[in-house]
Interface confidence: medium
């Protein structure tokens, strides 16, 4: 056996352990995905986390455990078999994803305040139609995982929410804000999360009242809701990550590059080989 | 830290027109409108008007429209107002003021522009 | 047009009073209310929002109430550097109005 030929071996066994490794972490993405979408409760109890925006993720991971799989799986099977096609396609999809990333990134770089500005539109939309429309929960229950996350509420303030006529406080009671907003940490005194339902949220029924998220609040006078809005949290939240975002997408990128490189470099070897070994019959 | 500098005094010529500009530091310059208030010598605030510089949309009060113009320049994060035809009771500070959306409390002020209508 | 009155149009109080300044509108205004504090030659600044939100680095001596046309200003205990205008505001419908202003005097 050649260097070439045991390089080439390498190779192909390489792309088939590297890819049947992402083909399984697409599965697993996949099955949780699926898991969301047909039992919320029990993922949830399982994550132990509040305000998850599952309708959002069940998709998502579902939609890119397919994709995984997808790509994983031409890359084992022609990396396997030694298919010039499968590997020709596995590198195509590859290089669409990659070229997508770079595009996604130079648009990112590019239009930052356009972006930032339809980010803060979609925002806006979404406080002002809070608990309107049951169709609108995906939207909903991410914005609540932002604010609870990030620990921020609003988007420039807190006092956001009160130009939504829904969570605005009749007569002497006070303003009302989403659950997410509240500081949990911040008090011990289960009062405060007076939990709201508003009339006009009771006629949603059921639909309404199922997720937590979705839950308002009162806002007593020196309540425990965060002061910050999610437009100064999502800025500090980015510029503490950058290092981190930057690093996984650099990451990303070089492992993409890789097995493009050694997908095609195997695809273009292949007839070589081949050649050869029909020399020696 | 936010920061709203306005352009000098200006002492104009009734019947003149004058521009008095707002330069915004310190944040995102097209995520918040631009308010405009005027103050006349002992007197009330007045709200003129206010601008979204994201989209160069304006409010104004009819109070005012007409005469006073608003305007952006989102490359130097800068507003402007243009007052026209000025009279002695145009004679006031001017505040450029800014507020996250139009309905809302102005949360930042320039240090006001004293214009000056005198023949 | 919504027209906002604020009531005294001057105090005189000392240090260590509490204050309330009023301010009636004359409809509605669901609570779409802010309070801005003016010293002489200053620019005003804003202490309230929402009728009852103070803004960031107001001290809480500083605080709001109301609903429908009344709101309240109150300052629990005033420090020297409280004297001021006070004025209200209403951002509920257009065009925006504000009260005549409350001058608070050391007594």
């Known amino acids: 056996m050649s260097a070439q030929e045991s390089c080439l071996s390498l190779i192909k066994y390489f792309l088939f352990v590297f890819n049947l490794f992402f083909f399984v972490l697409g599965s697993l993405i996949f099955c949780f995905g699926i898991w969301i979408l047909i039992d919320k409760t029990s993922f949830v109890s399982f994550v132990g986390l509040a305000f998850v925006p599952l309708q959002i993720w069940s998709k998502v991971l579902a939609i890119s455990g397919i994709f995984t799989m997808g790509i994983a799986l031409l890359g084992c099977v022609g990396a396997l078999k030694e298919l010039r096609c499968l590997l020709g396609l596995y590198f195509g999809m590859l290089l669409l994803l990659f070229a997508t990333q770079i595009t996604l990134g130079i648009l990112i770089s590019t239009q930052r305040a356009q972006l930032e500005r339809s980010l803060r539109d979609v925002v806006e939309k979404t406080i002002q139609k809070y608990g309107t429309n049951p169709e609108e929960t995906a939207a909903e229950e991410s914005w609540d995982y932002v604010q609870f996350q990030l620990r921020c509420c609003g988007w420039h303030y807190p006092q956001d929410w009160f130009q939504v006529l829904i969570l605005r406080g009749n007569g002497s009671e006070a303003h009302r804000v989403p659950c997410s907003c509240y500081n949990l940490s911040a008090t011990n005194d289960s009062t405060i999360l007076d939990k709201v339902i508003l009339p006009q949220l009771s006629r949603l029924g059921h639909l309404a009242r199922s997720r937590h998220s979705a839950d308002i609040c009162a806002v007593p006078a020196e309540s425990h809701i965060y002061r910050e809005g999610c437009a100064q949290g999502l800025q500090k939240w980015l510029h503490n990550n950058l290092i981190s975002i930057v690093g996984i997408c650099l990451g990303v990128g070089l492992l993409e590059l890789g097995f493009m490189t050694l997908s095609i470099f195997l695809c273009r070897n292949l007839d070589h080989v081949y050649n050869r070994l029909a020399r020696y019959r | 830290q936010v920061q709203l500098v306005q352009s000098g005094a200006e002492v104009v010529k009734p019947g003149a027109s004058v521009k008095v500009s707002c330069k915004a530091s310190g944040y995102s310059f097209t995520d918040y409108n631009m308010y405009w208030v005027k103050q006349a010598p002992g007197q009330r605030l007045e709200w003129m008007g206010y601008i979204d510089p994201y989209n160069g949309d304006t409010t104004y009060n009819q109070k005012f429209k007409g005469r006073a113009t608003l305007t952006v320049d989102t490359s130097a994060s800068t507003a402007y107002i243009e007052l026209s035809s000025l009279r002695s009771e145009d004679t006031a500070v001017y505040y450029c003021?800014?507020?996250?959306?139009?309905?809302?409390?102005?949360?930042?002020w320039g240090q006001g522009t004293l214009v000056t209508v005198s023949s | 047009d919504i027209q906002m009155t604020q009531s005294p149009s001057s105090l005189s109080a000392s240090v260590g009073d509490r204050v309330t300044i009023t301010c009636k509108a004359s409809?509605?205004?669901?609570?779409?209310v802010d309070w801005y504090q003016q010293k002489p030659g200053k620019s005003p600044k804003l202490l309230i929002n929402w009728a009852s939100t103070r803004h960031t680095g107001v001290p809480s001596r500083f605080s709001g109430s109301g609903s429908g046309t009344d709101y309240t200003l109150t300052i629990s205990s005033l420090q020297p550097e409280d004297f001021a205008t006070y004025y209200c505001?209403?951002?509920?419908?257009?065009?925006?109005?504000f009260g005549q202003g409350t001058k608070l005097e050391i007594k």
């Open positions: 003021a800014r507020s996250p959306y139009g309905h809302y409390a102005m949360d930042y």
């Open positions: 409809q509605d205004v669901s609570t779409a």
């Open positions: 505001r209403q951002h509920y419908s257009t065009p925006f109005t």
